[in-house]
């Protein structure tokens, strides 16, 4: 019996086609992804084959305006369009808090939202009962397949979930999920989930009973034979991995955007054991061309858009300094608001030792594209804000080591003068730069601002310690020279749209007045 | 209950090739690795090579390629290990074995 | 290929005491070692799967461990049918490998 498998992650509010490189189309003729893109793939993959699934790994949420606009109504109003047969939670779902995934997904959602490591507890469990499952067993064709669902334990530090949802460990979670699904006669099984490649790799190994494994978290590109694009393989597609039980298990997952639908060919033998697979991720490219009514209903729903990006956030009463001749040489008061907003969009998990999980932010100063006159009456845009950071990437979460952090510093001063992006922009940190020393010993103090404490003070750094950052993600992966950064970083969370979290910060504050302060000596 | 019952001892000489089988029942065939092991006289264990009789993929340790060759027949069930060129070397008791059962074994004796 | 080295390659022990195998593995395998038995007449058990989950009907004196890049098998009282040949398997990556082995003789 085979089984197709077509899935999708980390689609990230990319509802629209997009450049090659995920961001706004501006080229048609070579753009990439988008729903009505992929309605045209997965209706034609459907006509040609028996038996096909459509999932989703989850972090449809949080990418573009699409979001900021309709806040997961465009979600379900889409996949229900593209009839998903089912979805994980992923991270994201969560960023509008449990309330923002109720209201417009879980309960528009025609399809199953699945998680069985998060357990709902006290008011919230009876209303959010059934909006969500660990599994669901899905008829395809004249067999039943059982789909069960995990998500990050790290979101708590990553999104807004509440106190009310427990993240348990996935592998300890799933298990019984899968051997309750055995004990209905289920067994064909998928695990679908939002926890990264390395996760999804372990799930493989040690969950028995669990036949494939669909990821996402990680934007993982997998493709055997010749990369259609410009992503560079992790592996091979299907990425096999051999369980503790001696069973090759296949692991898949297709990048992020939209710009990829993955496709696996699963054969099955009549006690509902792999025998075979194969696939590729399929590049929906300009080749293939947008469904028009779905084409025709994302021009519906884009004329709301175009009204939000000319609509007053919040207003500014001091010149928002964000010229390359500011911001590339010294501290700038755009890139302050910029990293506050950073750190301010990233406060959660504080207990009894800690006041927040994170208290640091670095931005190339070359990510900074435009300034803000006040003299416009004050008012910020979504348009203005998209001058600014005109290159919808995201502010990640990483974990680096105070050396890696020392490097990064170095970098970031080790050919001043020439108007070059890395010199960076800071917050929660103060760094103080000799630049009559030689480039890779100019930095004379470097002080980090304490999260295991009740009141935030500025420490030295340590070497050996280990710290969370927030940064765009063109930091994290090696942008603009930071090489140390991708190559030394211990642990990448993907985060907001850098507009997003922006936008959102101002609105919260109404009335803004960044300063120059003295971070950056 | 899993079984995996293999072939009866060999007597080869050197040059010639022998044909070592490994009948499995019990369990689903075709969706878990077959290892092949060899274990010469008061020595350990060295990891020849495994299939998978699903697919057909076949894995090697270096040393053991062009020496044995890994065969798989769906339709009884059976695992296969080929050995050629046979040397004095080759003398030792060959299993197969899954993660979590392993055959009697086979021994192989090359004498002129 | 990953190497493993596996040590004391001979060890002599009285009944009842309680004795620690390890091998060391030249690369990250994870969780994936498994400890094997084998009885004099060339009997091969598995006891030990994914480092430290015992196989059913092992009994419980076996116990796997993992510390860093070393994995241990600890028998806690040895018992008579205890004193025969141990292995560990790594199914981290292909090609997998073999400890050389411990032989376990009674004291």
């Known amino acids: 019996w085979e089984l197709t498998i077509l899935h999708t992650n980390d689609v990230h509010s990319r509802l629209e086609q997009t450049s090659e490189d995920s961001s706004k189309c501006v080229n048609a003729s070579r753009c990439m992804g988008g729903v009505a893109r992929l309605f045209t793939k997965v209706q034609q993959i459907r006509r040609a084959e028996p038996n096909v699934l459509l999932l989703d790994a989850g972090d449809q949420y949080q990418g573009t305006i699409w979001f900021t606009v309709y806040k997961g109504a465009e979600v379900a109003h889409f996949m229900n369009a593209l009839r998903y047969d089912a979805m994980a939670l992923g991270n994201h779902e969560f960023d509008n808090g449990v309330e923002g995934l109720i209201e417009p997904l879980l309960k528009e959602a025609k399809f199953p939202i699945l998680s069985a490591n998060i357990k709902a507890k006290g008011p919230l469990a009876s209303q959010i009962s059934g909006l969500y499952l660990p599994y669901k067993v899905l008829p395809v064709g004249d067999e039943v397949v059982g789909i069960v669902g995990y998500t990050s334990k790290e979101t708590p530090f990553l999104s807004n979930p509440g106190t009310n949802l427990v993240f348990e460990d996935e592998i300890t979670a799933l298990q019984p999920e899968v051997d309750k699904l055995k004990t209905l006669n289920v067994n064909k099984i998928i695990a679908l989930g939002h926890s990264g490649f390395e996760t999804d790799k372990l799930i493989a190994q040690k969950v028995r009973g669990v036949d494939v494994v669909v990821g996402g978290h990680s934007n993982t590109f997998l493709y055997t034979g010749n990369p259609p694009s410009k992503e560079v393989p992790a592996g091979k597609y299907p990425f096999i991995v051999t369980s503790d039980d001696g069973r090759k298990v296949p692991v898949v997952q297709a990048y992020a955007f939209g710009k990829y639908l993955g496709y696996l060919k699963i054969e099955f033998d009549e006690r509902g054991n792999v025998i075979s697979s194969h696939g590729n991720p399929i590049l929906l490219n300009s080749s293939i061309p947008e469904d028009p009514s779905i084409k025709a209903d994302i021009n519906k729903w884009r004329i709301k858009l175009d009204n939000y990006s000319t609509q007053e956030l919040g207003k500014t009463i001091v010149y928002l300094d964000g010229s390359s001749q500011s911001c590339r040489f010294r501290e700038c008061n755009m890139g302050n608001l910029i990293c506050d907003a950073m750190i301010n969009n990233n406060l959660r998990h504080a207990d009894e030792m800690f006041w927040n999980h994170v208290s640091m932010c670095i931005l190339n100063g070359g990510g900074i594209r435009s300034p803000i006159d006040e003299r416009n009456n004050g008012t910020i845009t979504w348009e203005n804000l998209a001058a600014v950071l005109p290159f919808g990437g995201t502010f990640d979460l990483v974990q680096l080591k105070g050396s890696t952090l020392k490097k990064a510093f170095e970098h970031s001063v080790h050919r001043y003068g020439q108007s070059t992006g890395e010199f960076l922009q800071v917050g929660g940190i103060h760094v103080v730069y000799d630049l009559s020393r030689k480039p890779g010993d100019r930095v004379v103090k470097l002080d980090v601002l304490c999260t295991k404490c009740r009141v935030p003070s500025y420490d030295p750094l340590k070497m050996d310690e280990i710290y969370k950052v927030i940064l765009p993600n063109f930091l994290a992966n090696g942008g603009d020279g930071f090489q140390m950064i991708k190559d030394e970083l211990l642990r990448h969370d993907s985060g907001d749209q850098d507009i997003n979290v922006v936008s959102t910060y101002i609105s919260k504050m109404k009335v803004i007045y960044p300063a120059v302060e003295g971070r950056i000596k | 209950q899993i079984q995996l019952q293999q072939s009866g001892a060999e007597l080869a000489r050197p040059g010639a090739s022998v044909n070592l089988s490994c009948k499995a029942s019990g369990y689903s065939f075709t969706s878990y690795w077959m290892q092949w092991l060899k274990q010469r006289p008061g020595q350990g264990l060295e990891w020849i090579g495994a299939i998978y009789p699903g697919d057909g993929d076949t894995r090697y340790t270096q040393k053991f390629k062009g020496k044995a060759t890994l065969t798989a027949d769906k339709s009884s069930s059976t695992a296969y290990m080929q050995l050629s060129s046979l040397a004095s070397e080759d003398s030792a008791v060959y299993y197969c074995?899954?993660?979590?059962?392993w055959g009697q074994g086979t021994l192989v004796t090359v004498s002129a | 290929d990953i190497q493993m080295t596996q040590s004391p390659s001979s060890l002599s022990a009285s009944l009842g005491e309680r004795v620690s195998l390890t091998c060391r593995a030249s690369q990250d395998i994870g969780s994936s070692l498994n400890w094997l038995q084998q009885e004099p007449d060339g009997t091969f058990k598995r006891l030990i799967y994914?480092?430290?989950t015992l196989d059913s009907g092992v009994p419980k004196r076996f116990s796997g461990s993992r510390s860093g890049s070393d994995y241990s098998l600890t028998i806690s009282s040895l018992e008579s049918e205890d004193f025969v040949d141990y292995y560990c398997?790594?199914?981290?990556?292909?090609?997998?490998?073999f400890g050389g082995g411990t032989k376990l003789e009674i004291k």
């Open positions: 398997l790594q199914y981290a990556s292909f090609p997998y490998t």
């Open positions: 074995a899954l993660f979590s059962y």
């Open positions: 994914a480092t430290s």
